[in-house]
Amino acid sequence: APVPPGEDSKDVAAPHRQPLTSSERIDKQIRYILDGISALRKETCNKSNMCESSKEALAENNLNLPKMAEKDGCFQSGFNEETCLVKIITGLLEFEVYLEYLQNRFESSEEQARAVQMSTKVLIQFLQKKAKNLDAITTPDPTTNASLLTKLQAQNQWLQDMTTHLILRSFKEFLQSSLRALRQM
């Protein structure tokens, strides 16, 4: 399992460490989740050839994974702090159902999958404290999420492997874009 934020293995031990600021906590939290995703991707790629597959588009049609676009205000051109923060939080909330799907998809990295899921919940809480306009954040409908989860779990083995790969890849992309955007705030 990855080292929890605040005990980052990259840190040099400091005798009197300052408490982390809000921005630093968020940055570390995202890096921590990204490290977890890297470990999960390793298992996925070692277990199947999904990481080299050219048939991603087939599976991608079944998924509606959050993506950053220029209109979301998170890119440097047209950057808008409030719009972007709403997009990041909304996107993370939308990813939660997909992270739930990942929970039974790993053998040797089961703990890691749980750590990614729980750390994402903590990240959402950090970001919600930072957001001024919480009304603009739409929470996914639990009934819709439940039926999506059932649908994903009913796929054949190949599609399930591909779905796992795509979720990890998309979540990594989303977090990387979020990390850059949050550094501008």
């Epitope: 990259k10 840190d11 040099v12 890119f75 990594k172 992309e173 874009s177 850059r180």
Partner: antibody, heavy 120, light 106 residues
């Protein structure tokens, strides 16, 4: 193995537009987290970061030069192009392109550089 | 925009000496800092990333430390092949380089 190579004119006239191409191999700019950046170094001076472009077409520019710079990518050709308009003698420098990978964001592979002189 | 102040601008030390270079950011950059080595006529080479991580193939005599706004680069035992200019660079927003430190042998 990762390689990057800069190409373009060695001499540019003042007020013209300088266009430089970075051709790379060993990685793809369609891979999430991948970035190619441009850095320059006037003779005997320090490194100056100019711009970089991410795999998803997000672009960052040096604020001091933002109005004069444009960066674009051609993923199929493994190329990134930097354009700088209205050049002057102060733009004489060695121009480097470099790769950044993933969220640790350090330039881990560099081209050998191309010396561009701005003179009439 | 965040400014990087690197010091000293140059230093002279003997082979085997411990060499320290510092880089100060105008605001917290949360350990998003890299150190590079550049030899005359060559492209820079990455030595340290994320403030403390040694890049692949870099000798262990090089190290980085620091957090917040203050960062340090250390060569534990200076070797003749370490003669070069060293730069820091941050990655919090738009990433400028420090002004560089030229390391020479006495």
């Amino acid at each position: 193995q990762v390689t990057l190579r800069e190409s373009g004119p060695a001499l540019v006239r003042p007020t013209q537009t300088l266009t430089l191409t970075c051709t790379f191999s060993g990685f793809s700019l369609s891979t999430s987290g991948m970035t190619v950046g441009w850095i320059r170094q006037p003779p005997g001076e320090a490194l100056e970061w100019l711009a970089h472009i991410w795999w998803n077409d997000d672009k960052y520019y040096n604020p001091a030069l933002k109005g004069r710079l444009a960066v674009s990518k051609d993923t199929s050709k493994n190329q990134v192009v930097l354009s700088m308009n209205t050049v002057g003698p102060g733009d004489t420098a060695t121009y480097y392109c470099a790769r950044m990978e993933d969220y640790d964001e350090a330039m881990d592979y560099w081209g050998q550089g191309i010396l561009v002189t701005v003179s009439s | 925009d965040i400014q990087m102040t690197q010091s000293p601008s140059s230093l002279s030390a003997s082979v085997g000496d411990r060499v320290t270079i510092t880089c100060r950011a105008s605001e917290n950059i949360y350990s998003n800092l890299a150190w590079y080595q550049q030899k005359p006529g060559k492209a820079p080479k990455l030595l340290i990333y994320a403030a403390t991580y040694l890049a692949d193939g870099v000798p262990s005599r090089f190290s980085g430390s620091g957090s917040g706004t203050d960062y340090t680069f250390t060569i534990s035992s200076l070797q003749p092949e370490d003669i070069a200019t060293y730069y820091c660079q941050h990655f919090w927003g738009t990433p400028p380089f420090g002004q560089g430190t030229k390391v020479e042998i006495k």
